[in-house]
């Protein structure tokens, strides 16, 4: 016998397309950016890729995901220092041996160009003009997102 | 010479308990359950805890939190099955030899009573009556949430 | 102000042990990739170890690797060095230095120390 | 591990002069190298970095150029405070960090 719980999961796989009237967020919250229908916060400490991930999570956000060049590009253009390195939510996946956003999306190899090798604890950071392969223990920078959206949006099913 | 970002950033650290208009969350979203402050949303499918934790934010949400003992028997309440483990968001800290929230807080000695070895890769999980110790890799269910919050909510500091 | 001062350096016999610190001030120590870099009288210049934030990621230049240790205490804003079995190559002016921020394991050295003198000779 | 080798290994010059120095390194570093000035019984300072970054607080009179294994110091109009040794470093994310052997830059 099903659970209420389990009763409502089964309902959210058969209902992944449902929008749902509830407040979206119209306006970036204070101190994040906007860049087109995201609002982003890039960090001032540095932590390695899991606390960063963990740290957008506790701010109701996610590490950020990038769609294409084009945001990519849009992004970087925000970074003012050459140097600096920021987590982006895309890490190696050994298991499936491919580069896997935190979405559980794959990496269309065309989006972006990583400089260094795609293996085992490997994470990705971007720079000001570069995409870099970096050992996901490395202690840097990230970048949160979180969606603008209209008042009527998307439900949440599993991933 | 700091970028606007870094400014922004230094900005935030020295405006921890500012609040800011913006829309809060003030229903909870189509299939996430309300529990006091708070929506919960239970997985129907498994992950290991780093996955879940993705999952969680790639919702804009957080694995779930749990304040004390209180929230902790409610959050059980709504457990059906006396089986079933869900992560939550609290895992092993090697570096401080401590149980840490993804928030950045230790765990409180007194507010869970944890069954199982305090130890490298272990996250923890809840049943409908306990609480365990678990390797991270393990595959089970998880909780995210979300914080209903009024119109008038905290901005998002670095952790 | 920002500054970085090395101290424990000293004449010290083949075989002995030295630990070097070096105290941090003027700006947010957790958050930087610290390194002790060295340069023997009259040559050019050798990373030696870096130590991540955190503490958690170490590494060693081949030449000091098993002998040497480094260490940080974040509340203290200090770094350490911990030298032992010491040898007459290992005498050089040891150099505290912070990387720029958020560059990762990618370092370059944007402060650094006055340095400290150890000499290894019998 | 990656080998840089500077050349020359000292230059003399007069100050008002262009003074180049270049840097080799054994395999390919992409961007990860920083140039270094040091004066005698000082610790070094951090000039360029990521190949072509000024560092904060440094002339533009020094810039950096290259990528790959082929980077470029260049002091465009020589003072008498630049009379000093210059080092690279490469800056690859796999230790060791590795330093050229400096090039000297004396006094015509």
């Known amino acids: 016998q099903k659970s209420s719980i389990e009763k409502c999961s089964v309902d959210i796989q058969q209902s992944r397309n449902k929008t749902t009237e509830r407040p979206g967020l119209l306006n970036c919250p204070i101190y994040w950016q906007q860049l087109r229908e995201k609002c982003l916060l890039f960090s001032h400490t540095v932590n390695p890729w899991n606390n960063s991930l963990a740290d957008c999570s506790t701010k109701e956000s996610s590490l950020l995901l990038i769609r294409d060049k084009d945001e990519l590009i849009h992004t970087q253009n925000l970074i003012r220092d050459k140097a600096i390195l920021f987590w982006i939510g895309l890490n190696f996946s050994l298991s499936e041996k491919n580069w896997k956003w935190i979405n559980g999306s794959f990496l269309n190899s065309n989006d972006l160009e990583i400089r260094g090798d795609a293996k085992e604890n490997s994470c990705i950071s971007i720079s000001q003009t570069s995409v870099y392969s970096e050992y996901c223990s490395t202690e840097i920078r990230w970048i949160c997102q979180k969606e603008l959206t209209p008042v009527r949006n998307k439900v949440y099913p599993d991933s | 010479q700091k970028s606007s970002i870094e400014k922004c950033s230094v900005d935030i650290q020295q405006s921890r308990n500012k609040t800011t208009e913006r829309p809060g969350l003030l229903n909870c979203p189509i299939y996430w359950q309300q529990l006091r402050e708070k929506c919960l949303l239970f997985s129907h499918t498994v992950n290991p805890w780093n996955n879940s934790l993705a999952d969680c934010s790639t919702k804009e949400s957080s694995l779930l939190l749990i304040r004390d003992k209180d929230e902790l028997i409610h959050t059980q309440n709504l457990i059906r099955d006396k089986a079933i483990l869900f992560w939550i968001g609290l895992n092993f800290s090697l570096s401080e030899k401590n149980w840490k929230w993804i928030n950045g807080s230790f765990l409180n000695s007194n507010d869970l009573e944890i069954r199982g070895d305090a130890k490298e890769n272990s996250c923890i999980s809840i049943s409908q009556t306990s609480v365990y110790s678990e390797y991270c890799s393990t595959e089970i269910r998880w909780i995210c949430q979300k914080e209903l919050t009024p119109v008038r909510n905290k901005v998002y500091p670095d952790s | 102000q920002v500054q970085l001062v090395e101290s424990g350096g000293g004449l010290v016999k083949p075989g002995g042990s030295l630990r070097l610190s070096c105290a941090a001030s003027?700006?947010?120590?957790?958050?930087?990739?610290m390194s002790w870099i060295r340069q023997a009288p009259g040559k050019g210049l050798e990373w030696v170890s870096y130590?991540?934030?955190?503490?958690?990621?170490?590494a060693y230049a081949d030449s000091v690797k098993g002998r040497f240790t480094i260490s940080r205490d974040n509340s203290k804003n200090t770094l350490y060095l911990q030298m032992n079995s010491l040898r007459a190559e290992d005498t050089a002016v040891y150099y505290c230095?912070?990387?720029?921020?958020?560059?990762?394991?990618?370092?370059?050295?944007?402060?650094w120390g006055r340095g400290t003198l150890v000499t290894v000779s019998s | 591990d990656i080998q840089l080798t500077q050349s020359p290994s000292s230059v003399s010059a007069s100050v008002g002069d262009r003074v180049t120095i270049t840097c080799r390194a054994s395999?390919?570093?992409?961007?990860?190298l920083a140039w270094y000035q040091q004066k005698p019984g000082k610790a070094p300072k951090l000039l360029i970095y990521?190949?072509?970054g000024l560092q904060s607080g440094v002339p533009s009179r020094f810039s950096g150029s290259g990528s790959g294994t082929d980077f470029t110091l260049t002091i465009s109009s020589l003072q008498p405070e630049d009379f000093a040794t210059y080092y690279c470093?490469?800056?690859?994310?796999?230790?060791?960090?590795?330093f050229g052997g400096g090039t000297k830059v004396e006094i015509k």
């Open positions: 003027g700006f947010t120590f957790s958050d930087y990739y």
């Open positions: 990521a190949a072509s």
């Open positions: 230095a912070r990387s720029l921020m958020a560059t990762g394991t990618h370092l370059y050295f944007d402060l």
């Open positions: 395999q390919g570093i992409s961007s990860w």
């Open positions: 470093q490469q800056s690859t994310s796999f230790p060791p960090y590795t």
């Open positions: 130590i991540s934030p955190s503490g958690a990621t170490i």
